[in-house]
């Protein structure tokens, strides 16, 4: 067990042109808050997939009102860390989504309105117990600077928070075979004995005699990959005849808890422990109703008239996401041919074509070689929207007008003489050298009997020959 901690340092306009407008104004003061979603592994799942490692919501930041005419500065941030507790082992590799939300504090009916300002995502490797890792992510014209770390909750220690520490029994040293628990040198690694046969790679224990599985593994000894479940046996190990160790489906399999809720089995079913801001049997209710205006960009809110029923946003064309907060990236379909640059102007798509191509989707290939001539017997080659000359031997340059000297780059080593030849170049090697470019001394530097290295050189040392 442990805690993932996120510290937001700044949120403001990124470098470069096109600074964003301040999200707040004198007429509409606002404040920021952040949401973090964590998933195990290096998954590239959709933003809406469950935050299986956990999620957290920050407190609201100070109220901010834009000073008229002033550029958007770094915006005032909420105090404190965002903390995402994890109950099991820290996976080491994880994916994150950090969302910056704006809460408008105008006098609109129904209380404050929320809108998503920016969303950044990434995949990282991180060992628990390590130092703070710093990061900068950009979303559009906004830039988010933050640090994060994972730390184990005592008595857990180690890079995955799976080793346990106990206070020392003797003042001087730990028992046989047990290390001190850095950085807690006054504690010793506990002699934790998992269930006999528990997989050292895929299982761990927090109490002696148990065997708990890392994600993706199952069975009493965590030796069976979840995906290979071909057994339809009752829950628990089946009879010896099938040799099948895969448990049947359990109520928490596939994690029925949404929004980062953690699932625990009960005698009859399951129970979701929901993160702050969510509730319901499966943490599917966010505490937000249609009265709060949760649908952005003209989305139509349906349901959710009372706090116990969830709302659904029906998004207008061009937007998607559970709150219609994401613009559909029509350029992701790559409508522009031949390397054209796609511009989504909102009302229309526009393709900016590379040289040599034209048409609404850059589908027309112009004749690159039309009216172009290559000198000295060179031939024009079309391609990529720019003509290129394939030059005859002995000539070079864009239009084959330059006489090429194959010997200009001193291509013969060890004093070999270079001769330009109709087929390229020829090296006439100095005595004692051979190879196409005279790069191999026949008897290196006259090295005589042992030691077996050129004089004054140990094998492995570089030696300069000009």
């Amino acid at each position: 067990a442990g805690v993932f901690e996120l510290q937001i340092h700044s949120f403001g306009p990124g470098p470069g042109p096109g600074a964003p407008r301040s999200p707040c104004s004198a007429r509409l003061p606002c404040r920021l808050f952040f949401r973090v979603c964590l998933k195990p592994g290096l998954s590239e799942e959709a933003a809406e997939s469950p935050c299986a490692l956990g999620a957290a919501l920050s407190a609201r930041g100070p109220v901010y009102t834009e000073q008229p005419g002033a550029p958007a500065p770094d915006l005032p941030l909420p105090d404190g860390l965002l903390q995402v507790p994890f109950r099991d082992a820290w996976p080491g590799t994880f994916s994150f989504i950090i969302e910056t939300w704006r809460e408008e504090l105008g006098d609109q009916i129904g209380g404050p309105a929320w809108s998503l300002l920016a969303r950044v995502a990434g995949r990282r490797r991180l060992a628990a117990g390590g130092p703070w890792a710093r990061d900068i992510q950009r979303a559009g014209a906004w830039e988010l600077r933050f640090s994060y770390r994972a730390r184990c909750e005592p008595p857990a220690v180690g890079t995955a928070c799976t080793r346990l520490c106990r206070p020392r029994s003797a003042p001087s040293r730990c028992g046989p075979g047990l290390r001190p628990c850095a950085p807690l040198e006054d504690e010793c690694e506990a002699p934790l004995v998992c269930r006999a046969g528990c997989s050292p790679e895929h299982g761990f224990c927090e109490q002696p005699g148990e065997c708990r599985c890392l994600e993706g593994w199952t069975g009493p000894l965590c030796t069976v990959p979840v995906s290979t479940s071909s057994c339809l046996s009752p829950r628990g190990p089946s009879s010896a005849t099938t040799g099948c160790l895969v448990p049947g489906p359990g109520p928490c399999d596939g994690n029925p808890c949404a929004n980062g809720g953690s699932c625990s089995e009960t005698p009859r079913s399951f129970e979701c422990t929901c993160p702050r801001g969510f509730y319901g049997l499966r943490c599917e209710v966010s505490g937000v109703t249609c009265a709060d205006g949760p649908c952005f960009n003209g989305g139509l809110c349906v349901g959710g008239a009372d706090p116990d029923s969830a709302y659904i946003c029906h998004c207008p064309p061009g937007f998607q996401g559970s709150n219609c907060e994401k613009r559909v990236d029509r350029c992701s379909l790559q409508p522009c041919r031949n390397g054209g640059l796609c511009l989504d102007l909102g009302h229309a798509l526009r393709c900016r074509c590379r040289a040599g191509f034209a048409g609404p989707r850059c589908e027309h290939d112009l004749d690159d070689c039309a009216g172009r001539a290559c000198a000295n017997g060179g031939t024009c080659v079309e391609g990529g929207g720019a003509h290129r000359c394939s030059c005859a031997l002995g000539f070079g340059g864009r239009d084959c007008r330059e006489r090429a000297d194959p010997c200009a780059a001193r291509p013969c080593a060890h004093g070999g003489r270079c001769y330009a030849h109709f087929s390229g170049l020829v090296c006439a090697c100095a005595p004692g050298y051979m190879g196409a470019r005279c790069e191999f001394p026949v008897h290196p530097d006259g090295a005589s009997a042992l030691p077996a290295a050129p004089p004054g050189l140990r094998p492995g040392d570089p030696q300069r020959y000009l």
């Epitope: 080593a413 196409a436 790069e439 030696q463 300069r464």
Partner: nanobody
Framework: EVQLVESGGGLVQPGGSLTLSCAAS????????MAWYRQAPGKKRELVAG???????DYIDSVKGRFTISRDNAKNSVYLQMNSLRAEDTAVYYC???????????WGQGTLVTVSS
């Protein structure tokens, strides 16, 4: 700085075969001209086979048809396949690299090949 590490030497009977490997680090072998040299006790070090940057190969007369030098760009290594080995092939075999950008040569530490019945 280019580092060269040879491996694959050992004891082999006359007529047997052996493959020597030379793993390079610090530069890609495709940018280097590389060769195998050998030095028998009491004798000068001599070139055995070379492979130029462009892939052309050279051999001394006594190994032509028996030894083959090759390069694997993906593994960043050069190999010497030695067939029909003779007692006179017994020597320490050294890997050599010539770096064209700096015109500097580099040597490995050597691997011993013993041909004996």
């Amino acid at each position: 700085e280019v580092q060269l590490v040879e491996s694959g030497g050992g004891l082999v009977q006359p007529g047997g075969s052996l493959t020597l490997s030379c793993a390079a680090s610090g530069s890609r072998v495709s940018f280097l001209s590389m060769a195998w040299y050998r030095q028998a006790p009491g004798k000068k070090r001599e070139l055995v086979a070379g492979i130029s940057k462009d892939g052309s190969t050279d051999y001394i007369d006594s190994v032509k048809g028996r030894f083959t030098i090759s390069r694997d760009n993906a593994k960043n290594s050069v190999y010497l396949q030695m067939n029909s080995l003779r007692a006179e092939d017994t020597a320490v075999y050294y890997c050599y690299a010539y770096r064209w950008t700096t015109r500097v040569t580099y040597w490995g530490q050597g691997t011993l090949v013993t041909v004996s019945s």
